[in-house]
Amino acid sequence: SAPGEDEECGRVRDFVAKLANNTHQHVFDDLRGSVSLSWVGDSTGVILVLTTFHVPLVIMTFGQSKLYRSEDYGKNFKDITDLINNTFIRTEFGMAIGPENSGKVVLTAEVSGGSRGGRIFRSSDFAKNFVQTDLPFHPLTQMMYSPQNSDYLLALSTENGLWVSKNFGGKWEEIHKAVCLAKWGSDNTIFFTTYANGSCKADLGALELWRTSDLGKSFKTIGVKIYSFGLGGRFLFASVMADKDTTRRIHVSTDQGDTWSMAQLPSVGQEQFYSILAANDDMVFMHVDEPGDTGFGTIFTSDDRGIVYSKSLDRHLYTTTGGETDFTNVTSLRGVYITSVLSEDNSIQTMITFDQGGRWTHLRKPENSECDATAKNKNECSLHIHASYSISQKLNVPMAPLSEPNAVGIVIAHGSVGDAISVMVPDVYISDDGGYSWTKMLEGPHYYTILDSGGIIVAIEHSSRPINVIKFSTDEGQCWQTYTFTRDPIYFTGLASEPGARSMNISIWGFTESFLTSQWVSYTIDFKDILERNCEEKDYTIWLAHSTDPEDYEDGCILGYKEQFLRLRKSSVCQNGRDYVVTKQPSICLCSLEDFLCDFGYYRPENDSKCVEQPELKGHDLEFCLYGREEHLTTNGYRKIPGDKCQGGVNPVREVKDLKKKCTSNFLSPEKQNSKSN
């Protein structure tokens, strides 16, 4: 029988009546066009909904938009279009919501052709009131908030000017012209690239990288011959053109661009690309594209300085620049990432790492599941996960994999069981241990979301027909109840729940279609009465993450420490609540060679934990570029993995001697940098 259809499944008592009393319908009094939804702040219950409708006329397009606001998690909405003077809002800019709980919102309006500049509507009280502001420029991008100060905004204009506001968009100042890309760094720093000879595209590879730490009063050129740049964790990356040819290399800085080191990564040609897949304050995952139109490349993981890289995964699926990759950070368990590889026969397979890229393996075949037609051996196969690539290929996959930091261990994804990803209709699988083991959760494709930190999982079948049924589980997807939320089925368009998975409200969005009209409609269901009581100590059990062999003294050790968590028992039907904080207890592990990566000039042979010297470097002095100087490295081949907390045990020694010579291969040496003030 399908999951949840066993008679033994514990049924939640009287749930139909409880949910019926907590189901709120809202019909939006406008024609169906597009709808976008944004949450304003955390735990505020404020949602903004923007509906837009385009009517193509003979010469131009007539547009109409409406703005709605809810302050009870979507149970009721109020039309507040009059607060923005019934102005048409440009959906391509979305709603720019301020960081944290600032309550700030910026909407960018459509203006008539001949106007001097654009127009924005600003709110700093969670969209209760808006102020109209006319801009001295036409915006090219959405307003970007400084992560440190939500009063500081930056935007690029259609004329490639970099504009900054220090008073939440009230007054704007152009601080630089000829800007291609701008990003906020830490401490209200702005990094941006500029062109000299005409355009961003024409100057690609000859751009300059600039920095301002005082919102445009003074500037420093921190890089030349720049192709592009990116920020990840505490690292600033720039891809820089080589002097002699059309190749480029990655340089990295950990001091906001004052000093640079060349990353020990392969250079790439014109048709190739680099991509930061994930980064934190400890390390970075970098994808380096393979030459030719292969659709794959190599993942490298960095050391703690972002300079020395270890090869992590070959044949990593990543279509052209800005294309699709399935690389997914499993946020519900430390160190876990899932992605896809393109095998020699062009089939796509899913790989998982539990130790931040140290080793990759196939996903374990779910218990009680059969291998599909892609499997050569019907008894041996793996689970393969559908992610961005499958969605881009228009497979019947409505959602990417889902995990939440506060729903420890839970991962939900569409997948198939075989030797490779299948084009057949997928099922939904769940892992409760961060990806080590999997179970089929639902038959066929579904939309799904996590509520109350994992206390409830909600799902809706993906169907081309109108729907009126929602499924929910209170035991991490083992058993399912179905609830008919409306008599009249709707064409379903999406599930919306507050980011962070702490809410107990879910909104089902869709439209109704009658003979002449079609209207947006939302149903918001509050599950608070299903989880009647607050969870107590007895509702939780202790769980050791990353446990694979209890007889191993270091069982559960990943990156030098193990973590025990208090997890909700599957049988407990209670509220974790909004204030739920994951309870965990770390224990430091003894160091082993697994806690070290191979240093510059060393590599690990397959299935070996020892680092050996690269044959081509044997007997040579190891000299490499660091902070624009040449360094001499005395090493026995090991460097501690970033973020690894192990103590004691094995301890390989390492020493770096400064040769005090300038690094000729470093295109971003400090000598080439200059400063200027406005």
């Epitope: 514990g10 241990d433 059990t541 202790i542 191993d552 559960g556 025990q564 049988s571 224990s587």
Partner: antibody
Framework: QVQLVQSGAEVKKPGSSVKVSCKAS????????ISWVRQAPGQGLEWMGG????????NYAQKFQGRVTITADESTSTAYMELSSLRSEDTAVYYC?????????????????WGQGTTVTVSS | DIQMTQSPSTLSASVGDRVTITCRAS??????LAWYQQKPGKAPKLLIY???SLESGVPSRFSGSGSGTEFTLTISSLQPDDFATYYC????????FGGGTKVEIK
């Protein structure tokens, strides 16, 4: 082969406390929870609580909360159960048992190794 | 706490008989149930974990089934060594045991 060896029989007065030890040998003590289970004469089994030696995370049955303290010493691979405010109803055989473990969950797979039991008699 | 109700409390059977003991949980415990055998003056011995998984070294005549709230321990052909008291134990709440079933010679 894992073994759990418990301390010897005890005779106690009402109102006093008793501390029973349980020493593990031949296995990875730190990675398994140790439960304490008692059995009054002619009665069934009753779980009192348990501890995970690594980190010392203990939890107790509601009935014994406040009266029982379970501890573990990783260096000697020994778990302890102390029961205070003893009364005659506490007369029983007290067992320590290792919670079997196949995954990260410490308490879900039954108790696969048991101590020989310690008889505690409470009498005035 | 979750209550475990075991039945029957006593069972008379002969060698070679097929014996079935049931255990009911007061709420769903998924498959988190263990069965033990205890002989007088001895510590209990684990037979079955996770409702149906046989502990290593336990004869295959013992089997467990069920999930949710209803569970069964079956001895397919009773042997002389099997006369003992059997306990079920749930592990999905604070641990609780059933009251026990004494299997005696008919």
């Amino acid at each position: 082969q894992v073994q759990l060896v418990q301390s010897g029989a005890e005779v106690k007065k009402p109102g006093s406390s008793v501390k029973v030890s349980c020493k593990a040998s031949g296995g990875t003590f730190r990675n398994y929870a140790i439960s304490w289970v008692r059995q009054a004469p002619g009665q069934g089994l009753e779980w009192m609580g348990g501890i995970i030696p690594i980190g010392g995370w203990a939890n107790y049955a509601q009935k014994f909360q406040g009266r029982v303290t379970i501890t573990a010493d990783e260096s000697t691979s020994t778990a302890y159960m102390e029961l205070s405010s003893l009364r005659s109803e506490d007369t029983a055989v007290y067992y320590c048992a290792r919670q079997g473990r196949k995954t990260g969950y410490y308490y879900y797979y039954g108790m696969d190794v048991w101590g020989q039991g310690t008889t505690v008699t409470v009498s005035s | 706490d979750i209550q475990m109700t075991q039945s029957p409390s006593t069972l008379s059977a002969s060698v070679g008989d097929r014996v079935t003991i049931t255990c009911r949980a007061s709420q769903s415990i998924s498959s988190w149930l263990a069965w033990y055998q205890q002989k007088p003056g001895k510590a209990p011995k684990l037979l079955i974990y996770k409702a149906s998984s046989l502990e290593s070294g336990v004869p295959s005549r013992f089997s467990g089934s069920g999930s949710g709230t209803e569970f069964t321990l079956t001895i397919s052909s009773l042997q002389p060594d099997d006369f003992a008291t059997y306990y079920c134990q749930q592990a999905d709440g604070h641990i609780t045991f059933g009251g026990g079933t004494k299997v005696e010679i008919k």
